[in-house]
Amino acid sequence: SLLPVPYTEAASLSTGSTVTIKGRPLACFLNEPYLQVDFHTEMKEESDIVFHFQVCFGRRVVMNSREYGAWKQQVESKNMPFQDGQEFELSISVLPDKYQVMVNGQSSYTFDHRIKPEAVKMVQVWRDISLTKFNVSYLKR
Amino acid sequence: SLLPVPYTEAASLSTGSTVTIKGRPLACFLNEPYLQVDFHTEMKEESDIVFHFQVCFGRRVVMNSREYGAWKQQVESKNMPFQDGQEFELSISVLPDKYQVMVNGQSSYTFDHRIKPEAVKMVQVWRDISLTKFNVSYLKR
């Protein structure tokens, strides 16, 4: 069954955590649907963003952080492992020095930590997708 | 009650027709939610677009057409009559030479016809909004 979109969940992240998302674009790539995943510092959507991951399907991916309300330097990738009309599985793993983003099991993007992952309190998944799975797994201590 | 988004409806337009849309952004303007309204030439979403109207709430509006699969010259406006967190009523009227877009009763944007409005067969409303009303009114002959 489908999860509501925008989908918001409280989360605590640290090295070893993985956020897994399964979904499908709501439109054909010609129409450039978006997927966005934001790791927020508070439960409020207007809070700062430790890791902003935005896919413009068929075109590009941008990653960034929002600190003290201001967007910082954007990182852009033309790598596009997503398939038009197909379901995707996205996993974002917290490594010691960066986030590693896997798409359908394939390492596709990395983003160096600018803010400690421990600052994350909420994850939001939204824009032009249907969402079937959201999970945060924690490293067993 | 809410209409599904993306929302698609068959439509025939001509001078005097008005498309009315009522909705609300799904996120605060800081997070730049989008609203998109597309007037398509076929019932298929990959068809050409006679009038493409995209709002990046709080930032800008872009208008364009997609002809033979290719986007043409974009028209951009910084006019932003939409209010953060507030419901909006959008009406797009077909005038003899252009589309006139009203936001909350105020004339806000115009877009000259590039393709005959009679070519429109479908209207799609989508992206980051909740939708409470969609109506196409036809000029009484």
């Epitope: 201001a70 160096d112 600018r114 803010i115 421990e118 600052a119 | -």
Partner: antibody, heavy 121, light 107 residues
Framework: QVQVQESGPGLVKPSQTLSLTCTVS??????????WSWIRQSPGKGLEWIGA???????YYSPSLKSRTSISRDTSNNQFTLQLSSVTPEDTAVYYC?????????????WGQGTQVTVSS | SSALTQPSAVSVSLGQTARITCQGG??????VSWYQQKPGQAPVLVIY???GRPSGIPERFSGSSSGDTATLTISGAQAEDEADYYC??????????FGGGTHLTVL
């Protein structure tokens, strides 16, 4: 093993432009995610970050020195250069270049030995 | 003036524990690093990312941070630890700041 070495004139006249070069060996300045910084230490004072150039070529400057600072690079010689304009005696300091892996707010693991710059007429 | 505040001097008896604090940063957001500097030498990284210790740095050096305060701890201070210590962190991800420095005296 990465090594960084500063070079440049030890004496600069007031109002002139100070120019220092940092030569990097044992690693490329274009290697992903590394940032190459200039840091200075005035006599008897603490450390002050001046600015940096990223692996991508993008530059960052301390807000307090931004109007006078320019950092550029020469990838063929694996060097990056600091230019500080309109210097005054307050710019007298030991100038260090350093490597900061994984972002500006991270840490500096390799430092040059420093070069003394005196601003005096 | 430094965005990060350190005590100008700290004294410790040989073999005892020294603690040097660094205040005023947003250590909930940004990592803190610590550097040791001896006279006439370049700074040396002793702690990175709050509590990481580079290879070659003795185990007696450790770091922690909470809220707006970060602490460098030297357990069992040795004579060779006498030096100036600087904390460093971000004021945003594209700007970095240092503390004013602390002179550690080993008695």
């Amino acid at each position: 093993q990465v090594q960084v070495q500063e070079s440049g004139p030890g004496l600069v006249k007031p109002s002139q432009t100070l120019s220092l070069t940092c030569t990097v060996s044992g690693g490329s300045i274009t290697t992903n995610y590394f940032y190459w910084s200039w840091i200075r230490q005035s006599p008897g004072k603490g450390l002050e970050w001046i600015g940096a150039i990223a692996y991508s070529g993008r530059t960052y400057y301390s807000p307090s020195l931004k109007s006078r600072t320019s950092i550029s690079r020469d990838t063929s010689n694996n060097q990056f250069t600091l230019q500080l304009s309109s210097v005054t005696p307050e710019d007298t300091a030991v100038y260090y270049c350093a490597r900061g892996p994984k972002g500006l707010a991270s840490y500096y693991d390799y430092w040059g030995q420093g070069t003394q710059v005196t601003v005096s007429s | 003036s430094s965005a990060l505040t350190q005590p100008s001097a700290v004294s410790v008896s040989l073999g005892q524990t020294a603690r040097i604090t660094c205040q005023g940063g947003n250590f909930g957001y940004y990592y803190v690093s610590w550097y040791q500097q001896k006279p006439g030498q370049a700074p040396v990284l002793v702690i990175y990312r709050d509590s990481g210790r580079p290879s070659g740095i003795p185990e007696r050096f450790s770091g922690s941070s909470s809220g707006d305060t970060a602490t460098l701890t030297i357990s069992g201070a040795q004579a060779e630890d006498e030096a100036d210590y600087y904390c460093q962190s971000g004021s945003s991800s594209d700007n970095t700041v240092f503390g004013g420095g602390t002179h550690l005296t080993v008695l």
